[in-house]
């Protein structure tokens, strides 16, 4: 089981958009996987800020909630094992490590459940 995101770091200019793809390969279990996106900001690298989820509409942390509701930040499912995170207008505080997490409560499986990529906002 492997979660694949683009090779980083990614560089984008503030005010522009970014799309970060994520797909899971070599997995066992349901064909339709759930995805969660987190941001780890440089000033708090051990704090996972929930951005958006394919499963839970209440997943977003307060810092992202209004932008998710407005559709500025969204997760789009491409297929059962692939999604893309879209952020319409990047802000300086969007810089950090983005984690694509494929949550599982099934203890039968083995592998890696996340992929991470750094985004730098210029």
């Amino acid at each position: 089981r492997e979660v694949l995101v683009p090779e980083g770091p990614l560089y984008r200019v503030a005010g522009t958009a970014v799309s970060i793809s994520c797909n899971v390969t070599g997995y066992e279990g349901p064909a339709q996987q759930n995805f969660e996106w987190f941001l780890y900001r440089p000033e708090a690298p051990d704090t996972a800020l929930g951005i958006v989820s394919t499963k839970d509409t209440q997943f977003s942390y307060a810092v992202f909630k209004s932008r998710v509701v407005a559709g500025e930040v969204q997760v789009q499912r491409l297929q059962g094992d692939a999604v893309v995170l879209k952020i319409a207008r990047l802000q300086a505080q969007d810089a950090g490590i983005y984690e694509c997490h494929t949550p599982s409560t099934d203890t039968r499986y083995l592998g890696s459940y996340s992929g991470k990529v750094e985004l730098r906002v210029l």
Partner: antibody, heavy 115, light 107 residues
Framework: EVQLLESGGGLVQPGGSLRLSCAAS????????MSWVRQAPGKGLEWVSG????????YYADSVKGRFTISRDNSKNTLYLQMNSLRAEDTAIYYC????????WGQGTMVTVSS | DIQMTQSPSSLSASVGDRVTITCRAS??????LAWYKQKPGQAPKLLIY???SLQSGVPSRFSGSGSGTDFTLTISSLQPEDFATYYC?????????FGGGTKVEIK
Amino acid sequence: EVQLLESGGGLVQPGGSLRLSCAASGFTFSSYAMSWVRQAPGKGLEWVSGITGSGGSTYYADSVKGRFTISRDNSKNTLYLQMNSLRAEDTAIYYCARGGALDIWGQGTMVTVSS
Amino acid sequence: DIQMTQSPSSLSASVGDRVTITCRASQVIHNYLAWYKQKPGQAPKLLIYSASSLQSGVPSRFSGSGSGTDFTLTISSLQPEDFATYYCQQSYSTPLTFGGGTKVEIK
């Protein structure tokens, strides 16, 4: 009853080889990932290797990569660990265990690497 | 690789005591954390999985909590059969890694 039973341990000289087996019963073997975990005398637990239920993906600790090979035969409900180029530091009890959260363990088989 | 740091490495307690063991991961592992108990000469036994889920057949005096990087195993009232060594383990990514263990001894 869900059970794992290891075999194949023993005394081997440095540089030698050994093949461990783990016979599973009481559950659908092919539905579970499996792992080998070892414990050197008086020490803690060290994960050695793992394999997905289908056998399609294998994983290794850096300490054994290139020397050990994990495999499984789902038709025989058996997990294997082929250990080559054995070193003194590989001396340990080797356990097979089920899943990602290792919910079922065998009783272990002792591997001693010594001249 | 993800490092798992357990503390304390050993502790002395009496029957009936409340015992707390902590485990810290070197990076966020969400809730992919298990706890095991091992008695001398025996294989480890799973107590807690997914950080806080009690394995079937395990007494309710055992509980787990935490998420992210910091986790806790609590034994609410220590029983004679609980004197053993306890290990945490992450299954968030391979290689799976264990904490160094906590030996719970009789005071």
